[in-house]
């Protein structure tokens, strides 16, 4: 069977991560957003810079907070079949991309962000890394 190159696999994982983050943002950032103002009280921390795969450590660090926000939405207005499983899948993808031995020390912005701002920023980061890879 043909095997895909490491670069191709990395791109596929990034595209999957991008898709997952977009699904989350669509679920949160629509009119239902107003229905769940409690979600907007959660603080998220954004990386000072994120241009390489190792910077995904900064995303992994925030997945626990993301899980807690999604827990609020269960049986309410935002329907994910299994939020815990969804976050778990994102975590697996992130580890595949950054490597499990990554000891990168994440530097965060001083200003925290809402969950909507957080997801938008990480979507943009993923898009930027993908576009760099495909050049």
């Amino acid at each position: 069977a043909p095997t895909s190159s490491p670069a191709k696999e990395t791109q596929q994982h990034l595209e999957q991560l991008l898709l997952d983050l977009q699904v989350l943002l669509r679920g949160i950032d629509n009119y239902k957003n107003l229905k769940l103002p409690m979600m907007l009280t959660f603080k998220f921390y954004l990386p000072k810079q994120a241009t390489e795969l190792k910077h995904l450590q900064c995303l992994e660090n925030e997945l626990g907070a993301l899980q807690r926000v999604l827990d609020l939405t269960q049986s309410k207005s935002f329907h994910l079949e299994d939020a815990g499983n969804f976050i778990s899948n994102i975590r697996v993808t992130v580890v595949k991309l950054k490597g499990s031995e990554n000891k990168f020390e994440c530097q965060f912005d001083d200003e925290p962000a809402t969950v909507v701002e957080f997801l938008r920023r990480w979507i943009a980061i993923c898009q930027s890394i993908i576009s760099t890879m495909t050049q």
Epitope: K35, L40, T41, K43
Partner: antibody, heavy 117, light 108 residues
Framework: EVQLVQSGTEVKKAGDSLKISCKGS????????IGWVRQMPGRGLEWMGT????????RYSPSFQGQVTMSADKSISTAYLQWGSLRASDTAMYYC??????????WGQGTMVTVSS | SYELTQPPSVSVSPGQTARITCSGD??????AYWYQQKSGQAPVLVIY???KRPSGIPERFSGSSSGTTVTLTISDVQAEDDADYYC??????????FGAGTKLTVLG
């Protein structure tokens, strides 16, 4: 102009029922939570709970669960706070406030409720 | 139940800087909001999401956050700033909570 206008001062006896109102104007009343806040004489603010007028979804503070009932009539852009049986300890100023995506950004002028025993 | 802790009172002379703190275990992960309440009036939002100022609020009002403490800073304090100030945040459940309030007295 975005505003919330509350019903007037109420003087009641212990055991009476009461329903106070909060009418919104200048914005889409349906799609913003309306919170209720109690302020007893000389005391601080206490969050009582909140209601989403579009479908009357409500969340109560544990301290007020079962003590009051929140409701809304979206057709007339009005939220309500009611008591089945008032007590002297319900004497307070009651504020309604709109929760935008950031905070309680618009407040009513308050309704003073006095309950004599 | 979850509590936000504020000092009962702060006094400052006109033109000076007033700092009002609010502490709570959840504040590293929950935004804080600040309200001003003048005597006999409804509260007014002065700071949201720790540091943001609504339109119409003077630049003298600012907010900051560090760990479990958020701070409302009022620089060049004016007589009209004499009021009660309340911090508000959310607890770990689906509930909001206010601090007990701080009375800011502008001396003189």
């Amino acid at each position: 102009e975005v505003q919330l206008v509350q019903s007037g001062t109420e003087v009641k006896k212990a055991g009476d029922s009461l329903k106070i109102s909060c009418k919104g104007s200048g914005y889409n009343f349906d799609t913003y939570w309306i919170g209720w806040v109690r302020q007893m004489p000389g005391r601080g603010l206490e969050w009582m709970g909140t209601i989403y007028p579009a479908d009357s979804d409500t969340r109560y503070s544990p301290s007020f669960q079962g003590q009051v009932t929140m409701s809304a009539d979206k057709s007339i852009s009005t939220a309500y706070l009611q008591w089945g049986s008032l007590r002297a300890s319900d004497t307070a100023m009651y504020y309604c406030a709109r929760f935008s995506s950031s905070a309680y950004d618009i407040w009513g002028q308050g309704t003073m409720v006095t309950v004599s025993s | 139940s979850y509590e936000l802790t504020q000092p009962p009172s702060v006094s400052v002379s006109p033109g000076q800087t007033a700092r009002i703190t609010c502490s709570g275990d959840a504040l590293p992960r929950k935004f804080a909001y600040w309200y001003q309440q003048k005597s006999g009036q409804a509260p007014v939002l002065v700071i949201y999401q720790d540091t943001k100022r609504p339109s119409g609020i003077p630049e003298r009002f600012s907010g900051s956050s560090s760990g479990t403490t958020v701070t409302l800073t009022i620089s060049d304090v004016q007589a009209e700033d004499d009021a009660d100030y309340y911090c508000q945040s959310a607890d770990r459940s689906d509930s909001y909570v206010f601090g007990a309030g701080t009375k800011l007295t502008v001396l003189g």
